[in-house]
């Protein structure tokens, strides 16, 4: 025999108090699948948590973090403090990146500058706490007599249009 509750769609619950008819989820609750015997309470985004998506009868609310914080954990269950660019969050708070490392975001860890010489290149722009180094042409390309400029295209004879 088929369970009468299996006919109840998302956004409703199978109400045992009313002969197992499908009743809509009450305010501030939802059911994301059919055949539910109860609706789940909507998540409330309070304090540091801001509402990114309102709760509906078929889906939970989604939260993100207020400026100065960023989401951590499944479904943004926590908000971690931002640092400034050029810093990382340690057990003692936000600390500047050590020399030779950088962080171009407000979260995450300081990463080592790119080692240009590993690719046979030279440093074009030095790195900072906030920015990685910019690698340029290889030192061989910069040796005297060598040109890093692309040779110009051959000039056309005047009066001749391209074929």
């Amino acid at each position: 025999l088929q369970d009468p509750c299996s006919n109840c769609p998302a956004g409703t619950f199978c109400d045992n108090n009313r002969n197992q008819i499908c009743s809509p989820c009450p305010p501030n609750s939802f059911s994301s699948a059919g055949g539910q015997r109860t609706c789940d309470i909507c998540r409330q985004c309070k304090g540091v948590f801001r509402t990114r998506k309102e709760c509906s009868s078929t889906s939970n609310a989604e939260c993100d973090c207020t400026p100065g914080f960023h989401c951590l954990g499944a479904g943004c269950s926590m908000c971690e403090q931002d640092c400034k660019q050029g810093q990382e969050l340690t057990k003692k708070g936000c600390k500047d990146c050590c020399f030779g490392t950088f962080n171009d975001q407000k979260r995450g860890i300081c990463r080592p500058w790119t080692n240009c010489s590993l690719d046979g290149k030279s440093v074009l722009v030095n790195g900072t706490k906030e920015r990685d180094v910019v690698c340029g042409p290889s030192p061989a390309d910069l040796s005297p007599g060598a040109s890093s400029v692309t040779p110009p295209a051959p000039a056309r004879e005047p009066g001749h249009s391209p074929q």
Epitope: F49, L72, M78, C79, E80, Q81
Partner: nanobody, 124 residues
Framework: QVQLVESGGGLVQPGGSLRLSCSAS????????MSWVRQAPGKGLEWVSD????????FYEDSVKGRFTISRDNAKNTLYLQMNSLRAEDTAVYYC?????????????????WGQGTLVTVSA
């Protein structure tokens, strides 16, 4: 071991003020966000306020905004809740709670340590 001990509760008339304190020990207080949570008689737990580790970011339940002020003294390892313009509906046991990760604010379900609570009664 982590210990949180609240004090400062009592009987106060409507419109009056109280200042709750929460003395913390057993962890690096200055690295953790802290919260106040309350439980009115016969009701569930209700989040009241959060403060981040450094004290520069504070957050409040709508019903207490403008009346309650959360603060902390990291040198004294103490959390405070200044409660002004108290109402009968503020009657509850007030708990302080610690957040589980450094420099992170969690939801109430994830707080890892709670005090034993202090009772605030607002009545004429």
């Amino acid at each position: 071991q982590v210990q949180l001990v609240e004090s400062g509760g009592g009987l106060v008339q409507p419109g009056g003020s109280l200042r709750l304190s929460c003395s913390a020990s057993g962890f690096t207080f200055s690295s953790y966000a802290m919260s106040w949570v309350r439980q009115a008689p016969g009701k569930g737990l209700e989040w009241v306020s959060d403060i981040n580790s450094g004290g520069e970011s504070t957050f409040y339940e709508d019903s207490v905004k403008g009346r309650f002020t959360i603060s902390r003294d990291n040198a004294k390892n103490t959390l405070y809740l200044q409660m002004n313009s108290l109402r009968a509906e503020d009657t509850a046991v007030y708990y302080c709670a610690k957040h589980p990760l450094t420099y992170t604010i969690a939801t109430m379900n994830d707080y890892d340590y709670w005090g034993q609570g202090t009772l605030v009664t607002v009545s004429a």
